[in-house]
Amino acid sequence: KSSNEATNITPKHNMKAFLDELKAENIKKFLYNFTQIPHLAGTEQNFQLAKQIQSQWKEFGLDSVELAHYDVLLSYPNKTHPNYISIINEDGNEIFNTSLFEPPPPGYENVSDIVPPFSAFSPQGMPEGDLVYVNYARTEDFFKLERDMKINCSGKIVIARYGKVFRGNKVKNAQLAGAKGVILYSDPADYFAPGVKSYPDGWNLPGGGVQRGNILNLNGAGDPLTPGYPANEYAYRRGIAEAVGLPSIPVHPIGYYDAQKLLEKMGGSAPPDSSWRGSLKVPYNVGPGFTGNFSTQKVKMHIHSTNEVTRIYNVIGTLRGAVEPDRYVILGGHRDSWVFGGIDPQSGAAVVHEIVRSFGTLKKEGWRPRRTILFASWDAEEFGLLGSTEWAEENSRLLQERGVAYINADSSIEGNYTLRVDCTPLMYSLVHNLTKELKSPDEGFEGKSLYESWTKKSPSPEFSGMPRISKLGSGNDFEVFFQRLGIASGRARYTKNWETNKFSGYPLYHSVYETYELVEKFYDPMFKYHLTVAQVRGGMVFELANSIVLPFDCRDYAVVLRKYADKIYSISMKHPQEMKTYSVSFDSLFSAVKNFTEIASKFSERLQDFDKSNPIVLRMMNDQLMFLERAFIDPLGLPDRPFYRHVIYAPSSHNKYAGESFPGIYDALFDIESKVDPSKAWGEVKRQIYVAAFTVQAAAETLSEVA
């Protein structure tokens, strides 16, 4: 087949036609439609929305749209036995109770089925004891407490502020420290930007607002009862005691009004330094326990949530490719929300909906993409990326053979300052080239490209004149595709100015105040940032699905591999004596990176020169590009994390949201000076260098001439 046979529109107009069809007004309309009631995973409302999306995607013109259901472990509060935290006096009387629900936002007072704030998958329990304030509950915060301040959290209830790291890591750290309960709260220092009013008058978190969220440590497992396999009708399910990643101690989230009541009475040690102080009018004493007058008072948690196997529904839409129908480009984002989902996820789902509509319009005019595009509306992302992971587990054999790329589409905005992109290095050039062709929506950049405003506002720390592109971590639905299956992945959204707004995420994240009005009044009244994100996400999908040669540049991987090798080497070199004693060498890794660089360079030269009219050679070169990401997968996975199999990138062991490079080596080196058996510890470092070097070399060889 001729390479243009996929379309009846001249190739250079394809992308333009697609982009021109995207309309801000439609995204606005879709967002409104998706946010009028809650769409909690496992509820009838979210099933109805799945069926609505299925119906609309069919109307838009997709070839097929199916629901894929799974029965997974979810978690809900007990409707008749609410969760709360008390301060109790010496007689056991409750003298203060945290609130049972958030004050409903204006206009939503009569909406039913708003799930009250809770920590999903918390076990039941009513622990009582003294409180210890543990800052953000990061690894380094517990090091400070235990090693420097000699404060023992064993048998204590800890209170931690949200932010900096994934909440599941906080809970894991608290468990390891021996705590018997965890209270999570949003401090105004992290969730209240100065000079901005609280919702409903602005985009800041009010004192009664609370962040919901799961507290699992799944490490990529998906449904806790069926790790590695789909939670289908004939699934074998583990017992709850063997479930993956469940917390073992009660956990509950509160807002800063309630946190004030708990923290204002804290006694014991003063905070170690100013980084432990938030913005409440409290001393931020660490404890344990309350100060003098209140020393006989204790904190008691009342947690009655239940874990239930519940049916969830993904929507999977297919637009069949005309030339390479067995090559899949996937655009996926989740549909389930904690409450209204004004930003998370529906600002993303509305963009996906408009992208599907635009592709459908082109298809109705006779166009088809070269490769198959799959569109996904994932369920139960908020409960641990469950919908996407179960679908990928069910379809893993197809995906590992046919998956070209995955583009994630959760929240389109977390601010309105500039673009934010996290992706595989293979996509750097695609993103650069695409954003140079798109108009910037930013004030002061009229008539300028998105690339220009993005580069100005978020410059690369390494390369002048280029924008920052970050590593993929986790905490979203690309995880299974990238970290487990090795499918090239990327994500894009509009973000805040990290320089001036140092709060974590956006203030109303996972609260009842994430409404349509939040977006329409305060973040993006014209929906111009949503439109830009639609153009970036949709443009990436278009290019990945339609370009004759896959728009991947393997040379960019070579550059970052060298950077990551330098970084991990410098970490190791903080222990020069031990490296000498245990004969630790990075030579093999640097050699492999050098080989990769040379082979990638030669491959790129061949890519420029080969005969693109020869479909066999074209397919061969494209397959080498497609399978390069796959080549970084170690089938054995990372130590104790079998579903994190990518050797170059994994979610940080200390923060699921963050990406770590050469994670196997990094984790082997982490806190190595405290290991009881240094010989064994440095032996593991050497083994991880070996695995990394082998993997880089093996990946390089996939780019060599095939014969």
Partner: antibody, heavy 122, light 111 residues
């Protein structure tokens, strides 16, 4: 305009019970803590009780503790005060008042009803 | 006997400035609890005049101002007008009583 309207006052004998209601004309009722404050005619104000917006916390003045119960029904935008074992010294105009901060108990009163007179007399 | 002490009455001629004091103790105002002020015109319900020591709700003229220092607070009224004639109450929180406390009220007479 936002309004609070008390009802249920009247003459009652000592030892008997009475239930006061306070109807709010706004949907945002469910986001505010609510108080009862009383005033003996010609005298000063005395705070009686408060309930948080969600009912999770209720606090009482020592003079009424164990006898009075404050409650609310957010679906009806209504606040209640159940008064048992009434005494002659409970005679007063009873005002319902809204707490000054949405979603919190800041313990001041930014909106008052007109009051309902309770007379405890044999 | 009220927990917060106010003068029973104050007076002033139209246009003058008057202040009403409110004295507490280390368990209320002195414990850094906020002070609020209410105006009660004859035959009506009280109305919030000053909240959190020195803030005026919308609609309250800037002739009214509040301050707090140590264990006491005060309300100042400048440019006295005839319709300012009313009872004025201060209010705070007391951590010994674990409850809201009021002053006994001050009757302002405009001469």
């Amino acid at each position: 305009e936002v309004q609070l309207v008390e009802s249920g006052g009247g003459v009652v004998q000592p030892g008997r019970s009475l239930r006061l209601s306070c109807a709010a004309s706004v949907r945002t009722f469910s986001g505010y803590g609510m108080h009862w404050v009383r005033q003996v005619p010609g005298k000063g104000l005395e705070w009686v009780a408060v309930i948080s917006y969600d009912g999770s916390n209720r606090y009482y003045a020592d003079s009424v503790k164990g006898r009075f119960t404050i409650s609310r029904d957010n679906s009806k935008n209504t606040l209640y005060l159940q008064m048992n074992s009434l005494r002659t010294e409970d005679t007063a105009v009873y005002y319902c008042a809204r707490d000054g901060n949405w979603g919190s108990l800041d313990l001041y009163f930014d909106l008052w009803g007109r009051g309902t007179l309770v007379t405890v007399s044999s | 006997q009220s927990v917060l002490t106010q003068p029973p009455s104050v007076s002033g001629a139209p246009g003058q400035r008057v202040t009403i004091s409110c004295t507490g103790s280390s368990s209320n105002i002195g414990a850094d609890y906020d002070v609020h002020w209410y105006q009660q015109l004859p035959g009506t319900a009280p109305k919030l005049l000053i909240y959190v020591n020195n803030n005026r709700p919308s609609g309250v003229p800037d002739r009214f101002s509040g301050s707090r220092s140590g264990t006491s607070a005060s309300l100042a009224i400048t440019g006295l007008q005839a319709d300012d004639e009313a009872d004025y109450y201060c209010q705070s929180y007391d951590n010994t009583l674990s409850g809201v406390v009021f002053g006994g009220g001050t009757k302002l007479t405009v001469l």
